[in-house]
């Protein structure tokens, strides 16, 4: 006559987080009398998951009615699976006694939990950098399982190659995190550029998650300055123009100095945007030539985005 067999037919079961997991177990015999217990893990530190005989296990239910006559199916269903439930589960037959005596264990079923990665969060540099400088962007996503994951960086649709990616922890874990850094060379045309961090994982059914960052948050395009004089007007007034072009962001203060003395200060606001996302601004200064005996040195002083001021000077000739 065959001895008691405890049969766990599946070596492994994979379940999506939030779903229910069914762990199958049947016994070949109702003898000897005694309960079936389910454990996660083996050895002295194993965790009791379900005991037919006693106890309250709110997330665990028996698939078959354990009180039914001739029941030899001791499969269980665990609801609302989380990554913390991952592990190997053993169905163990005990023989009635005081205490019950462990008789035979099933081979175990490894439960792996498929958990979606969190939405990737992309963060850029803390301070703006100018064109021709390289800045770093970081992308992070957490809580996924299994460990296999793919992360790609794109700038304006083109994949970036200067990338360093780590998945933690290195060993076995219930869930994992990914952190990736991409180095991006800025150009003056990058105000409208975007970097995208794209994460692909088995749980996403081919529909990757994306995190984005706008280079407008990371770039500073310093202005070009040009000071020109319009032709003398009949009333002895000269119109001097300071053209500030191709700058970003808009935060800009312009100061006119006449022979080193502040004449007027203006703040840029509500400027129209160029196609490339930069701004232009033109400021005029009327100089009354008849009020001066000597040539007038006009300076257009621009302070852009908190950077040191840039000056451009122009001398207005006063005829004797």
């Amino acid at each position: 006559e065959e001895e008691l067999q405890v049969i766990q037919p599946e070596k492994s079961v994979s379940v999506a987080a939030g779903d229910s997991a069914t762990l199958n177990c049947t016994v070949s015999s109702l003898i000897p009398v005694g309960p079936i217990q389910w454990f996660r893990g083996a050895g002295p530190g194993r965790e009791l998951i379900y005991n037919l005989k006693e106890g309250h296990f709110p997330r665990v239910t028996a698939v078959s009615d354990p009180t039914k006559r001739n029941n030899m199916d001791f499969s269980i269903r665990i609801s609302n699976i989380t990554p913390a439930d991952a592990g190997t589960y053993y169905c163990v037959k005990f023989r009635k006694g005081s205490p019950d005596v462990e008789l035979k264990s099933g081979a175990g079923t490894e439960l792996s939990v498929r958990a979606k990665p969190s939405a990737p969060v992309v963060s850029g540099p803390a301070v703006r950098a100018t064109a021709e400088h390289t800045v770093s962007f970081t992308c992070e996503s957490h809580g996924f399982s299994p460990r296999d994951i793919t992360l790609k960086w794109f700038k304006n649709g083109n994949e970036l190659s200067d990338v360093q990616t780590n998945v933690d922890p290195a060993g076995k874990s219930v869930s994992y995190s990914i952190r990736s850094t991409a180095r991006v060379l800025l150009t003056r045309r990058d105000v409208h550029s975007q970097v995208i961090c794209e994460v692909a994982h088995v749980t996403l059914q081919g529909d990757p998650l994306r995190g984005t960052a706008n280079l407008s948050e990371a770039i500073r395009v310093p202005p070009f300055l040009e000071v020109t004089q319009q032709s003398m007007r009949a009333d002895n007034q000269v119109n001097v123009t300071c053209q500030v072009t191709k700058f970003y962001p808009q935060r800009l203060q312009l100061t006119w100095l006449e022979n080193g003395n502040v004449s007027r200060t203006e703040m840029a606001s509500a400027l129209p945007e160029n196609k490339d996302g930069t701004y232009n601004w033109t400021s005029w200064l009327l100089v009354n030539v008849s009020a001066h005996r000597d040539d007038v040195k006009l300076t257009c002083q621009v302070e852009h985005d908190g950077q040191p001021a840039v000056n451009k000077s122009f001398s207005v000739k006063v005829s004797a």
Epitope: S29, L30, T67, R95, K96
Partner: antibody, heavy 115, light 111 residues
Framework: RQLVESGGGLVQPGGSLRLSCTAS????????ISWVRQAPGKGLEYIGT?????ITYFASWAKGRFTGSKTSSTAYMELSSLRSEDTAVYFC????????????WGQGTLVTVSS | DIVMTQSPSSLSASVGDRVTITCQAS????????LAWYQQKPGQAPKLLIY???TLATGVPSRFSGSGSGTDFTLTISSLQPEDFATYYC???????????FGQGTKVEIK
């Protein structure tokens, strides 16, 4: 699905007897067979349960004098060193108690120990 | 060994009556629920009514119910029928495999 006992009869004190319990309509391989007796006009008394070779157990009063064995269709119980107080109807039932209660039962076989 | 004490040992009742039989164990039964109830009529084998203290066996009328846990158990017949006049036995199991003991029986007779 039923159990049928046989082997009862008249036996002298000190004698032995072998009772059989044959299943029809189901297999005994995955079930224990328990034996219960009932002396004339008295209540029920549990004797023991026959499982596999190693899983066979008897009430403390029956140990040593009563033994059992089982195939997939028939269970046996050997009664030895019989005494007059062993006179009873002997029933077999499928099951080993707790979540495997005694059901169904055989009709019983009478064992009379008398000189 | 576990000792099962049934009461009363006999009772007289009429058809339609509610009948209650109790069974007390000398110690907690195994799993607090290793208690079954059997019905036996003269010249017949016992028949399973209730197991695991409160689970109704297949084919048993719903007027039979079992309750209790640990050491104190009850069999209730909600409305006695003519075919229910019989002797009722409880069977309790202790922690040892072979420690199964019947109560002495309760005979339900027609009043």
């Amino acid at each position: 699905r039923q159990l049928v006992e046989s082997g009862g009869g008249l036996v002298q004190p000190g004698g032995s007897l072998r009772l059989s319990c044959t299943a029809s309509g189901f297999s005994l391989s995955s079930h224990g067979i328990s034996w219960v007796r009932q002396a004339p006009g008295k209540g029920l008394e549990y004797i023991g349960t026959i499982g596999t070779g190693v899983i066979t157990y008897f009430a403390s009063w029956a140990k040593g004098r009563f033994t059992g064995s089982k195939t997939s269709s028939t269970a046996y119980m050997e009664l030895s060193s019989l005494r007059s107080e062993d006179t009873a109807v002997y029933f077999c039932a499928r099951g080993s108690a707790w979540n495997d209660p005694f059901d169904p039962w055989g009709q019983g076989t009478l064992v009379t120990v008398s000189s | 060994d576990i000792v099962m004490t049934q009461s009363p040992s006999s009772l007289s009742a009429s058809v339609g009556d509610r009948v209650t039989i109790t069974c007390q164990a000398s110690q907690s039964v195994y799993g607090n629920n290793d208690l079954a109830w059997y019905q036996q009529k003269p010249g017949q084998a016992p028949k399973l009514l209730i197991y695991l203290a409160s689970t109704l066996a297949t084919g048993v009328p719903s007027r039979f119910s079992g309750s209790g846990s640990g050491t104190d158990f009850t069999l209730t017949i909600s409305s006695l029928q003519p075919e229910d006049f019989a002797t009722y036995y409880c069977l309790g199991g202790g922690d040892d495999e072979a420690d199964n003991t019947f109560g002495q029986g309760t005979k339900v007779e027609i009043k």
